[in-house]
């Protein structure tokens, strides 16, 4: 039985050219996290964090994605095309798979402030 919940940074906004931290947190379960996958709105993988083997950043994102903090992901040099949904998928044992959603809006305005809040989707 899957008892856990994924908390995410929810809907966030950040400036074009800036950076943003994508964070998910799995709570309310004792399940072991074996792998975390980070995906973009077009279903392409940005990164995988395997519990035993470490981080794999996909080649297309190598220059703009930094692993961490923790199981999160830092997306750098933001462009308007980065606006959209991001998904964290937690593979766990024995529970199975948990999935969280974050919506990132990249703003042109130089006065746009990065906003983030933890929420349960």
């Amino acid at each position: 039985m899957m008892t856990g919940t994924i908390e995410t940074t929810g809907n966030i906004s950040a400036k074009k050219g800036g950076s943003v931290i994508l964070q998910c947190h799995l709570s309310s379960t004792m399940a072991q996290v074996t792998q975390v996958n980070w995906e973009q709105h077009d279903h392409s993988l940005l990164a995988i964090r395997n519990a035993e083997l470490g981080w794999h950043i996909y080649p297309a994102f190598k220059d703009r994605v930094a692993p961490g903090p923790g199981l999160g992901l830092t997306l750098q040099s933001l462009t308007m095309n980065d606006t959209g949904e991001y998904f964290c998928t937690y593979h766990t044992y024995p529970d199975g798979t948990y999935r969280g959603r974050i919506f990132l809006e990249v703003l042109e305005s130089s006065v746009a402030e990065h906003s983030a809040r933890f929420q349960i989707p």
Epitope: T34, Q35, N37, E39, H43, S44, L45, I48, N50, E52, L53, G54, W55, H56, Y58, P59, H91, T97
Partner: antibody, heavy 119, light 107 residues
Framework: DVQLQESGPGLVKPSQSLSLTCTVT?????????WNWIRQFPGNKLEWMGY???????SYNPSLKSRISITRDTSKNQFFLQLNSVTTEDTATYYC????????????WGQGTAVTVSS | DIVMTQSHKFMSTSVGDRVSITCKAS??????VAWYQQKPGQSPKLLIY???YRYTGVPDRFTGSGSGTDFTFTISSVQAEDLAVYYC?????????FGGGTKLEIK
């Protein structure tokens, strides 16, 4: 260049244990990556069995978890497969392979060793 | 388990032809797919990783594409030495699984 070479008995009796060795040259198994066992059944089906990582942690295919053990000897740069309580269904060609984190795929494979389970 | 299905066990082609081999995942695997080539009497060899990326030294006639559940491996101009079995493999989760293989036969 990285090379992997499997060795072990080609014939094992049912209910006994299958033990294979993979000798790695050209790369230290404690440096990085995951060191895997994969088998190929007659008819070509491939099955990932498990790995031992550079740090010594292991990950196994759940379908084999109760029967499989992967260990290593770092001084000889070797890792080992032990599969207990074998049946004729375990007849296959067994490969060792390196799983590279930068490609997230198996980039180097051994030549394979055929194992028949028969009385 | 994620099942990777290669619907064609055999494909027949001629030298110089373009051929595409398909692989379907039983559930979403994003772009976490690799393709391997196994020539007769040899071990598998990595050709494509993470869906579209060509491994070091692999000729550019080999390409991979797809995301989600549907993946395609293409040889733009088949050579005689491409006679082999081709496998897809997913690493979306920690139980890595392979497709059943597609044997490419040269007419």
């Amino acid at each position: 260049d990285v090379q992997l070479q499997e060795s072990g008995p080609g014939l094992v009796k049912p209910s006994q244990s299958l033990s294979l060795t993979c000798t790695v040259t050209g790369y230290s198994i404690t440096s990085d990556y995951a060191w895997n066992w994969i088998r190929q059944f007659p008819g070509n089906k491939l099955e990932w069995m498990g790995y031992i990582s550079y740090s010594g942690s292991t990950s196994y295919n759940p379908s084999l978890k109760s029967r499989i053990s992967i260990t290593r000897d770092t001084s000889k740069n070797q890792f080992f497969l032990q599969l207990n309580s074998v049946t004729t269904e375990d007849t296959a060609t067994y490969y060792c392979a390196r799983f590279m984190i930068t490609t997230f795929a198996m980039d180097y494979w051994g030549q394979g060793t055929a194992v028949t389970v028969s009385s | 388990d994620i099942v990777m299905t290669q619907s064609h066990k055999f494909m027949s082609t001629s030298v110089g032809d373009r051929v595409s081999i398909t692989c379907k995942a039983s559930q979403h695997v994003s772009t976490a797919v690799a393709w391997y080539q196994q020539k007769p009497g040899q071990s598998p060899k990595l050709l494509i990783y993470s869906a579209p990326y060509r491994y070091t030294g692999v000729p550019d006639r080999f390409t991979g594409s797809g995301s989600g559940t549907d993946f395609t491996f293409t040889i733009s101009s088949v050579q005689a030495e491409d006679l082999a079995v081709y496998y897809c493999q997913q690493h979306y989760n920690t139980l890595w699984t392979f497709g059943g293989g597609t044997k490419l036969e040269i007419k």
